[in-house]
Interface confidence: low
């Protein structure tokens, strides 16, 4: 659901990751988009406690930029998804081991909540930076 609005990021969980004056997409399918999206990051972050130092900053960037997507203002505000290549870099390079564990836990139903699934992008469904350089966000 891409109904929402653009707003300057005023949260806390992604403060260290997003640009200071970042314009982010807030999804109005949530009653309180700012808090709901912050909670999504928080829930996913609890699962990321034990990741490696190599994976951690990449995972932070991916999480925050996926849940608080860059927003293209206009008559219809539009979220700009992360470029597929950056998503794949996190999945296959920086966090390969952790990503496998996460997928295994998901398949085996070991997560207490399915909320984290909303926090993890499906890389294959994201636009490539080679299609249209302005259609996706670079981490």
């Amino acid at each position: 659901d891409n109904k929402g609005y653009c707003a300057q990021y005023r949260g806390e969980v992604c403060n260290a990751v997003l640009a200071k004056d970042a314009l982010v997409f807030l999804n109005t399918s949530y009653a309180d988009p700012e808090e709901a999206q912050e909670l999504l990051v928080h829930t996913a972050w609890n699962e990321l406690k034990v990741v490696s130092p190599v994976c951690r900053p990449a995972a932070e960037a991916l999480l925050c930029n996926h849940i608080f997507q860059e927003c293209s203002p206009g008559v219809v505000p539009t979220p700009i998804p992360i470029c597929r290549e950056y998503c794949l870099a996190v999945k296959e390079l920086f966090c390969a081991k952790e990503w496998l564990v996460m997928e295994e836990k998901t398949h085996r139903g070991l997560y207490r909540s399915e909320m984290h699934l909303l926090s993890v992008p499906e890389c294959s469904k994201l636009p490539s930076m080679h299609w249209d350089p302005t259609a996706c966000a670079r981490l």
């Epitope: 005023r10 949260g11 806390e12 969980v13 992604c14 403060n15 260290a16 990751v17 309180d32 700012e34 808090e35 912050e38 990051v41 928080h42 972050w45 609890n46 406690k49 034990v50 932070e60 925050c64």
Partner: antibody, heavy 120, light 108 residues
């Protein structure tokens, strides 16, 4: 840089309500989380609760029934109310930035603290 | 209720290494934070996210994590490091904050 300053009465009678205000200067309260922490004389630290600038609150379960934290973004202040106080609530009360249960959940900076004594 | 356990006191000679531990069942899942508090002063953050050091904190302060225990290490302890040290973390479900009971570091 951001500075915090607690204010309020230093003496409260048993069974009454303790009220403190924290004024934030050098930055806007309209981001981050804002917390209250207390320290009884000669003892350790105890987290009381926090408020997000939007008004969402989380409280320590052990104090939840007596605590109210509110925010006034127009004054760049947030406040603590603790009801039905007893001598056990005598402590130095600190306000601090942070404590949001997310990526950046440390307390920094802190106010200098204000001693509140509960006595008749 | 969830608890973090610290030794009440640790003593070291100047120049030696001080290690202060903090134990809690949720520490494998939740980050730990360390604060230094000198008499009559507010606490100061010295380590965040288990092992990160804020700017302005001397390099002799470091943090590590192993299972249910996190450790604050002060290498080459100086007289000015004498203080109380508190660890902070969340319960396993991440709903409230807990502080350890504090450790008094004495520099002999």
């Amino acid at each position: 840089q951001v500075q915090l300053q607690e204010s309020g009465p230093g003496l409260v009678k048993p069974s009454e309500t303790l009220s403190l205000t924290c004024t934030v200067s050098g930055g806007s309260i309209s981001s981050y989380y804002w917390s209250w922490i207390r320290q009884p004389p000669g003892k350790g630290l105890e987290w009381i609760g926090y408020i997000y600038f939007s008004g969402r609150t989380y409280y320590n379960p052990s104090l939840k029934s007596r605590v109210t934290i509110s925010v006034d973004t127009s004054k760049n202040q947030f406040s603590l109310k603790l009801s039905s106080v007893t001598a056990a609530d005598t402590a130095v009360y600190y306000c601090a930035r942070g404590g949001g249960l997310g990526i950046s959940n440390w307390f920094d900076p802190w106010g200098q603290g204000t001693l509140v004594t509960v006595s008749s | 209720s969830y608890e973090l356990t610290q030794p009440p006191s640790v003593s070291v000679s100047p120049g030696q290494t001080a290690r202060i531990t903090c134990s809690g069942d949720a520490l494998p899942k939740q980050y730990a934070y360390w604060y230094q508090q000198k008499p009559g002063q507010a606490p100061v953050l010295v380590i965040y996210k288990d092992s990160e050091r804020p700017s302005g904190i001397p390099e002799r302060f470091s943090g590590s994590s192993s299972g249910t225990t996190v450790t604050l290490t002060i290498s080459g302890v100086q007289a000015e490091d004498e203080a109380d040290y508190y660890c902070q973390s969340a319960d396993s479900s991440g709903t409230y904050w807990v502080f350890g009971g504090g450790t008094k570091l004495t520099v002999l």
